[in-house]
């Protein structure tokens, strides 16, 4: 990946990750040097006959760090602290070829929760107002709500009349969605509207 | 049926401010969120953030951080766009959008041409 | 921020022939989205999460990829094709546009 560009690469927290690195063809590789943010991470010679030598030069990542036998880095257990910019230099008797790479440390979704405030009117008709929250969600988390197929809104909140007299029982699910993973979960109109109204007439008695 | 209607262009001068209204219909306003979208003369277009329209929370991209301000009125379903300090730079078409979720932009509005000019 | 690249930068057909149009991301994303723009026009709801059609749009337009690499293909061009359209994708905050294809009359 060229310098220009850096390849933007997903990881997931406390999974591992590869940053692939590209040879160039028939060259003979002198070192390479792996940087994170621009500090020294490792320093490698190959060599024909025997194993590398691998200098791990960063000890914060050093024992979560090893490398592929093309050289590529491979980062466990990955923290969120491990988001940044990585270079590779492979440096050859007649070249020196960089290789940038970004890389975002995503959150699996986990804990999808929904909460109700809702209201029941004079009429009958029951007004849903729906939460839905996940843990340690950041902005690259996307929300909506859906019924029978159809978005109803695409925030993590939903109001909603239900009129139980002309509506059939229906479920609202909610989605919760970032680029490594997706949780959902659905409530009953029916049933949160005939919580709201055992309170309504506890109220009025 | 289901619509943004923004308000009309704006010749301002460098240093000046402008407030651009996005009003929607047809739809409870309050479930979708509202996203700003930028357009300079011949040019891309550019996601400029999004108003969570039920808490009123903005969000900006990093390059529209600072002068650039999104608010609501949602007793009238509008959304505002404000620029203060302007610079010949924010020449351009602004436009509203519905997110239908996954930032999915379904609905837009006619766009709002901003000229800046001494 | 993901840069998604889209080409080529103008293509130039006739009608009746086909179009295949490129969103190329710098990171994998979960769905890419397109839009169709006209002069003067704002921009139209095209395609959603990667294949779904947007309400009106005729089965001449389809969409395909995944990961890094999607597709715009338009099967036999009409007159009313002649536009330019733009890649968008919601995996990753800022939600960036590719830099649009303009679809232009050989």
């Known amino acids: 990946q060229s310098s220009l560009t850096p390849l933007m690469v997903n990881g997931i927290l406390g999974e591992s990750v590869t940053l692939p690195l590209e040879f160039p063809a028939g060259e003979k590789v002198n070192f390479i040097t792996w940087l994170f943010n621009e500090t020294s991470l490792a320093f490698i010679v190959p060599h024909e006959t025997k194993s590398p030598e691998i200098h791990v030069t960063n000890p914060k990542q050093g024992k979560r760090l090893n490398f592929t036998q093309s050289y590529s880095l491979q980062l466990s257990n990955l923290k969120m602290e491990d988001t940044g910019s990585y270079r590779a230099q492979i440096s050859t008797k007649t070249s020196a070829k960089l290789s940038s790479y970004t890389l975002r440390i995503l959150r699996q979704l986990r804990n999808i929760q929904v909460t109700n405030h809702s209201q029941l009117f004079q009429n009958m008709t029951c007004e849903l107002h729906l939460t839905c929250s996940v843990e340690d969600a950041d902005d690259n988390v996307s929300f909506r709500w859906e019924a029978l197929g159809n978005t109803l809104s695409s925030q993590p909140n939903l109001t909603v009349s239900w009129d139980p007299r002309i509506s059939s029982e229906q479920d609202y699910t909610c989605i919760a969605e970032n680029a490594v993973s997706n949780l959902s979960f659905s409530v009953s109109a029916q049933k949160l509207c005939e919580d709201v109204k055992i309170q309504y007439t506890d109220t009025k008695m | 049926q289901i619509q943004l209607v923004q308000s009309g262009s704006e010749l301002k001068k460098p240093g000046a401010s402008v407030k651009v209204s996005c009003k929607a219909s047809?739809?409870?306003?309050?479930?979708?969120?509202m996203n700003w979208v930028r357009q300079a003369p011949g040019q891309g277009l550019e996601w400029m953030g999004w108003?969570?329209?039920?808490?009123?929370?903005?969000r900006y991209a990093d390059d529209f951080k600072g002068r650039f301000v999104f608010s609501l009125d949602k007793s009238v379903s509008t959304a505002y766009l404000q620029i203060s300090s302007l610079k010949a730079e924010d020449t351009a078409v602004y436009y509203c959008?519905?997110?239908?979720?996954?930032?999915?932009?379904?609905?837009w509005g006619q766009g709002t041409t901003v000229t800046v000019s001494s | 921020q993901i840069v998604l690249s889209q080409s080529p930068a103008t293509l130039s057909l006739s009608p009746g022939e086909r179009a295949t149009l490129s969103c190329r991301a710098s990171?994998?994303?979960?769905?890419m989205h397109w839009y169709q723009q006209k002069p003067g026009q704002a921009p139209r709801p095209w395609i959603y999460?990667?294949?779904n059609l947007a309400s009106g749009i005729p089965a001449r337009f389809s969409g395909s990829g995944s990961g890094t690499d999607y597709t715009l293909t338009i099967s036999s061009l009409e007159p009313e094709d002649f536009a330019v359209y733009y890649c968008?994708?919601?995996?990753?905050?800022?939600?960036?546009f590719g830099g649009g294809t303009k679809v232009e009359i050989k």
């Open positions: 959008a519905r997110d239908y979720g996954r930032w999915y932009f379904d609905v």
């Open positions: 047809g739809y409870t306003f309050t479930n979708y969120g």
């Open positions: 108003i969570n329209t039920y808490s009123g929370e903005p």
């Open positions: 990171s994998s994303v979960s769905h």
């Open positions: 999460a990667t294949s």
């Open positions: 968008q994708q919601w995996s990753s905050t800022p939600r960036t």
